[in-house]
């Protein structure tokens, strides 16, 4: 009995659902009462899901698996794994027994995009040419381990004096901290790039240091030039710093964070006290750092509606303000592909291929191409619908006339995360039913 699975690993984002495709060719007269199907972990042979005696025996894997009961009779033994975790990564064996039997193993590769790196400087005040500074680049909640690259403003790699550490949290996701020690020139730009080797996703940030002293008495309020990119559901830090005068005490500090456009109050500190959050109780200052001039704001459980500009207003004797942009993002799921019609396909038939990707933000860019990588632009209709949380579901439809055979690929790009999610379908020349393996 020939059991077929994809050669390439199935890549699934943490928290999304994954389909482990498996198909077999049923003999004429086959009935589900004859089918014995087991999904198990290849290495440990731990049972994951089974079908026997004409009945789905259910999930033995944390109740997160399901078969496709309506498709089993056509030879589709694929397994749906819900809410993928890092711990799910590995090889799954699909074992099918009727009269004859066979098995095949499919690899699940788990991935999670890294957040846009945040950059910190130490020391961060009164910098002069010749000073040694430590630049820390931090990126969070990615998987698998990242590759980290540093370069200067001219794109020249910086390899000396770099220390990178990666720590996994309880979910197995990595937080990356890379430290570069440099001696300042007259001015300089330092870029950090965090690459997810599986998603081929690059997250980068840079800091430009112009050593100089601020004029006496002036409160110079500094925020990042680039927007702060935050994934939906994660916490974001809106960085803001000011230069306290000698003898400064927190009793003198007046700090307001507000929405730039509407001037709606977000958080404040006055009369020596944190006055708390005026923004759905999701904001916090860093009280231990205020005296050093760190007025940064932590925004928890970021939502799409938080996107926009936040103003950090500091008043001591002098006053100043600066606005920082928050750009919200959510990765798109791996596209699912459907064919219509999906049976008895022949060269010359017109088929509709639908590519669907879910719960991303902001709106995606969708590209189609053939097996040779040639873009397919004609007869493409793409729609994007936002749900109540403001996340987009993307559906792109390509109409094509089948050739002898062909591969059609759909790429869904998140323009902010620079994350590409792709799916493809290969249609062979002989009469066939889709999906061949799923």
């Amino acid at each position: 009995l020939e059991v077929q699975v994809p050669e390439d690993p199935v890549v699934a984002l943490v928290g999304t659902d994954a389909t482990l495709c498996c198909s077999f060719s049923p003999e004429p007269g086959f009935s589900l009462a004859q089918l014995n199907l087991i999904w198990q972990l290849t290495d440990t042979k731990q049972l994951v899901h089974s079908f026997a005696e004409g009945q789905d025996q259910g999930s033995a894997y944390a109740n997160r698996t399901a078969l496709f009961p309506d498709l089993l009779a056509q030879g589709n033994a694929s397994l749906r794994l819900q809410r993928v975790r890092v711990a799910d990564e590995g090889s799954f064996t699909c074992f099918v027994s009727i009269r004859d039997f066979g098995s095949a193993a499919v690899s699940l590769q788990v991935a999670a995009p890294y957040s846009k790196p945040s950059m910190t400087l130490e020391p961060n005040k009164d910098l002069r040419p010749g000073d040694t500074v430590t630049i820390t680049c931090s990126s969070y909640q990615g998987y698998p381990e990242a590759e980290v690259f540093w370069q200067d403003g001219q794109g020249v790699p910086l390899t000396g004096n770099v220390t990178t550490s990666q720590m996994a949290n309880e979910q197995g996701l990595f937080d990356v901290h890379s430290i570069l020690r440099v001696v300042l020139g007259a001015n300089g730009t330092y870029s950090c790039l965090v690459r997810n080797p599986v998603l081929q996703q690059d997250a980068h940030s840079s800091v430009t240091i112009t050593p100089q002293r601020s004029p006496t008495g002036a409160v110079e309020v500094q925020v990042p030039e680039d927007p702060v990119v935050a994934l939906v559901g994660t916490d974001a830090t809106l960085r803001c710093s000011f230069s306290p005068e000698p003898g400064f005490s927190l009793a003198q500090l007046n700090l307001i964070w507000q929405l730039t456009d509407t001037k709606q109050l977000v958080h404040s500190f006055t009369e020596g006290r944190d006055q708390g959050s005026a923004y759905a109780n999701r904001t916090a200052l860093f009280p231990d750092l205020l005296a050093q001039g760190n007025a940064s704001l932590r925004l928890q459980r970021v939502r799409v509606a938080d996107e926009g500009s936040f103003t950090c207003f500091v008043s001591i004797r002098d006053f100043g303000s600066a606005a920082v942009s928050l750009q919200v993002a959510a990765p798109y799921s791996k596209p699912s592909m459907t064919l219509e019609p999906n049976k008895d396909l022949r060269p010359g038939d017109t088929v509709t291929i639908t590519c669907s990707s879910y719960r991303g933000y902001p709106e995606a860019e969708v590209f189609w191409q053939d097996g040779q990588g040639v873009p397919l632009t004609g007869n493409v209709t793409t729609s994007q619908m936002a749900n109540e949380q403001g996340l987009f579901d993307v559906h792109s439809v390509l109409r094509v006339v089948l050739g002898a055979n062909g591969t059609y690929s759909c790429l869904v790009r998140n323009p902010v995360l620079q994350q590409d999610a792709h799916g493809s379908v290969t249609i062979t020349g002989q009469p066939m039913t889709f999906p061949p393996e799923a």
């Epitope: 004029p215 006496t216 008495g217 002036a218 409160v219 309020v221 003198q252 007046n254 006055t270 008043s315 001591i316 004797r317 002098d318 006053f319 100043g320 303000s321």
Partner: nanobody, 123 residues
Framework: EVQLVESGGGEVQPGGSLRLSCAAS????????MGWFRQAPGKEREFVAA????????YYAESMEGRFTISRDNAKNTVYLQMSSLRAEDTAVYYC????????????????WGQGTLVTVKP
């Protein structure tokens, strides 16, 4: 001790413009934030606008933003208030002040005050 002298007040018709000046002496002008306040007859003194020491940040009362512009020339130790589209309700004595610790819009944050200059808006 800082001394402040306002000038440029006078009578103007509705819709007209006026530029007030405030000259400072007796301190390091370029290290102070400065503000303008006004007091209409029979009313309390109210905040108009403030400017940071180097002029990079400004702060306005909401009702005056767009019509009034605060600026400064640190070389001349002078702060200015350009007023346009003036209305009858802008009639008041306008004061300039040197900011101390606190919010720019609060009178209690200011350490030194001028004597004021009268602006009258009438047809």
């Amino acid at each position: 001790e800082v001394q402040l002298v306002e000038s440029g007040g006078g009578e103007v018709q509705p819709g007209g413009s006026l530029r007030l000046s405030c000259a400072a002496s007796g301190g390091t002008f370029s290290s102070y934030a400065m503000g303008w306040f006004r007091q209409a007859p029979g009313k309390e003194r109210e905040f108009v606008a403030a400017i940071s020491s180097e002029g990079g940040s400004t702060y306005y009362a909401e009702s005056m933003e767009g019509r009034f512009t605060i600026s400064r020339d640190n070389a001349k130790n002078t702060v200015y208030l350009q007023m346009s589209s003036l209305r009858a309700e802008d009639t008041a004595v306008y004061y300039c002040a040197v900011k101390g610790v606190g919010w720019p819009q609060e009178q209690a944050s200011y350490d030194y005050w001028g004597q004021g200059t009268l602006v009258t808006v009438k047809p």
